[in-house]
């Protein structure tokens, strides 16, 4: 999937299986990514687990879990708030669009999470105070989480190089781990560009991600995924000058 | 291995709530040098871990991108502390502790928010 980190780095990661997205003293978010096509290096998020940890007089521990074709508007125990404590309403789930869009407000840690199902796959967005991001006591075991550190260098796909080369032939092969996977017909480059331009008129990294995804999969739903990801940034990002990211940021500390 | 503490201190120093060091300021290079020193001080106990190697490569990249010299001043991280997670000894009838922004305003002006997103393939 494409990742925008807390430090506004933008990466395309081929991480497969379960990976920690956020892991601090208050919250744990884990994603499971699966290959979008057999043999492809490109992966997308098929499962998301969020654990809100027990916090003072506010909330009991609550677990939220979403999977492909299952975007519940409740925690796994069936509740929609933080439990029986005095400040239980400081954690709330709201269904925005049934089966497609859920918002979780965790006011006790100043955090808003948006989970969507777009096509077969899930998207995730969060707004979180810096000091909550940094509230990690045990650096060893709460370690390498993707939102803070980005994905490891050996798990990154240089999709901008892909974008540059994609006008030529073999676009899908560039995104594959091995020889080109058998897949439904993907779009010609011009069609992908046109479809992405419709939804994402600014040629930023979200637009480029959209083009990459269409060329890689042929699945038009990924256009919407990029579009909603940008919409979520508009809602959640505190710095309105940083809504759009462009190529020049690609070499920021993706490995640090 | 304390390498992630180094990462966090660097992150805090370069995106703190007061005057964050922008990519092109001397403060950014100072923060990078602090980061480099911090990682070197963890080298022996982190040397086999991915986090350490990621940090070292990242620092090298950023040093060259921003033309930072290896020698020069270093910076101190800015950190504030949240109340501890888990059950509190003090039972409070007031839900103010359960509203981050309200309790934050008591200590400082406004929290500095960050964003992370994951989508597509």
């Amino acid at each position: 999937p494409h990742l925008r980190t807390f430090t506004d780095r933008f990466q395309t990661c081929k991480v497969q299986g379960a990976w920690p997205l956020i892991d601090n003293n208050y919250l744990n978010v884990q994603v499971t990514n699966t290959p979008v096509l057999p043999g492809s290096a490109a992966t997308a998020t098929s499962k998301l687990t969020i654990i809100f940890k027990n916090f003072q007089e506010c909330v009991d521990q609550k677990v939220y879990q979403a999977e492909m074709d299952e975007l519940p508007a409740a925690f796994v125990d069936g509740s929609k708030n933080g439990g029986d404590k005095h400040g239980a309403n400081s954690l709330k789930i709201t269904e925005k669009v049934s089966g497609q869009h859920v918002e979780i407000q965790a006011k006790y840690i100043g955090t808003t999470i948006v989970v969507r199902q777009v096509g077969r796959y899930l998207t995730f967005a969060v707004r979180m105070p810096e000091e909550v991001v940094n509230a990690v006591e045990d650096w060893d075991s709460q370690g390498l989480y993707l939102c803070l550190r980005g994905c490891p260098l050996n798990q990154q796909i240089d999709f901008q190089a892909f974008h540059t080369n994609a006008e030529g032939t073999g676009a899908r092969r560039l995104a594959a781990a091995s020889p080109a996977p058998t897949a439904p017909e993907t779009f010609p480059y011009e069609t992908a560009v046109a479809k992405c331009k419709e939804k994402l008129p600014v040629e930023d990294l979200y637009y480029q991600a959209c083009v990459f995804d269409l060329l890689t999969t042929g699945d038009v739903n990924f256009t919407l995924a990029a579009y909603y990801a940008l919409e979520d940034v508009k809602m959640l990002h505190s710095n309105k000058d940083k809504l759009h990211l462009y190529e020049r940021t690609r070499d920021l500390p993706g490995r640090a | 291995c304390k390498i992630l503490k180094c990462n966090s201190e660097f992150w805090s120093a370069t995106s703190g709530s007061h005057a964050p060091a922008s990519d092109d300021t001397p403060e950014f290079c100072a923060a990078l040098r602090s980061y480099a020193l911090c990682t070197r001080r963890t080298a022996r106990t982190c040397r086999g871990d991915l986090a350490y190697h990621s940090a070292v490569h990242g620092i090298e990249d950023l040093m060259s991108q921003h033309n930072c010299s290896k020698d020069g001043p270093t910076s101190q991280p800015r950190l504030r502390t949240l109340p501890p997670a888990g059950d509190s000894q003090e039972r409070s009838d007031s839900p103010e502790i359960c509203h981050y922004e309200k309790s934050f305003h008591k200590h400082s002006a406004t929290p500095n928010y960050t964003h992370c997103g994951l989508f597509g393939d």
């Epitope: 370690g143 050996n154 | 020193l37 001080r41 022996r44 086999g48 871990d49 991915l50 190697h53």
Partner: antibody, heavy 115, light 112 residues
Framework: EVQLVESGGGLVQPGGSLRLSCAAS????????MNWVRQAPGKGLEWIGM????????HYADSVKGRFTISRDNSKNTLYLQMNSLRAEDTAVYYC????????WGQGTMVTVSS | DVVLTQSPLSLPVTLGQPASISCRSS???????????LEWFQQRPGQSPRLLIY???SRFSGVPDRFSGSGSGTDFTLKISRVEAEDVGVYYC?????????FGQGTKLEIK
């Protein structure tokens, strides 16, 4: 919860070989250096060696250099210790431990070298 | 190779009383960048070793605050402010500054 489970120990004759395995769970195995440490019966701990997260470097104690080889398979979350030219003094409980310096340890597997 | 020498080798302590274990290194454990990589491990009878202290004085996750580490250069100390029954076992210092890494010979703590 971090879990490390060693296996493959047993009785072997001097000069023989044995391969120990360490199955890891509860953490992202491929992110961490790993160590092997041993403890002879009634004795103290002896560091054997370590391997980097990506197998790019390995370091060994002088007592096992050239005889023991540490390897790993990150796709299987498993660490290995191949022991050749075994001697009586290699008799010990062998532990694997997570991290570039050991933090979490397995329960150990006993290796007895005897004729 | 670095040799770590612990003393005493046996330490009988009364419950609730403090205990102190020394670890001396044959060469300085401070590296050129100012890092000092000395750890302390506890091994209870019949159990695997457990990390208590790393980087001289940092307590590992879940370790009670009655354990503390201090020292620099070649001299290091592990202190237990009030010994409890569960503290019985062998304590090892361990250095990671120089290859090959090495352990002290161990100090056996027992209850008087």
């Amino acid at each position: 919860e971090v879990q490390l489970v060693e296996s493959g120990g047993g009785l072997v004759q001097p000069g023989g070989s044995l391969r120990l395995s360490c199955a890891a769970s509860g953490f992202t195995f491929s992110n961490y250096g790993m160590n092997w440490v041993r403890q002879a019966p009634g004795k103290g701990l002896e560091w054997i060696g370590m391997i980097y997260y990506d197998s790019s470097e390995k370091h060994y104690a002088d007592s096992v250099k050239g005889r023991f080889t540490i390897s790993r398979d990150n796709s299987k979350n498993t660490l290995y210790l191949q022991m050749n030219s075994l001697r009586a003094e290699d008799t010990a409980v062998y532990y694997c431990a997570k991290g570039s310096t050991p933090d979490y340890w397995g329960q150990g597997t006993m290796v007895t070298v005897s004729s | 190779d670095v040799v770590l020498t612990q003393s005493p080798l046996s330490l009988p302590v009364t419950l609730g009383q403090p205990a102190s274990i020394s670890c001396r290194s044959s060469q300085s454990l401070e590296d050129s960048d100012g890092g000092t990589f000395l750890e302390w491990f506890q091994q209870r009878p019949g159990q695997s070793p457990r990390l208590l202290i790393y980087d001289v004085s940092s307590r590992f996750s879940g370790v009670p605050d009655r354990f503390s580490g201090s020292g620099s250069g070649t001299d290091f100390t592990l202190k237990i402010s009030r010994v409890e029954a569960e503290d019985v076992g062998v304590y090892y210092c361990f250095q990671a500054t120089h290859d090959p890494l090495s352990f002290g010979q161990g100090t056996k703590l027992e209850i008087k």
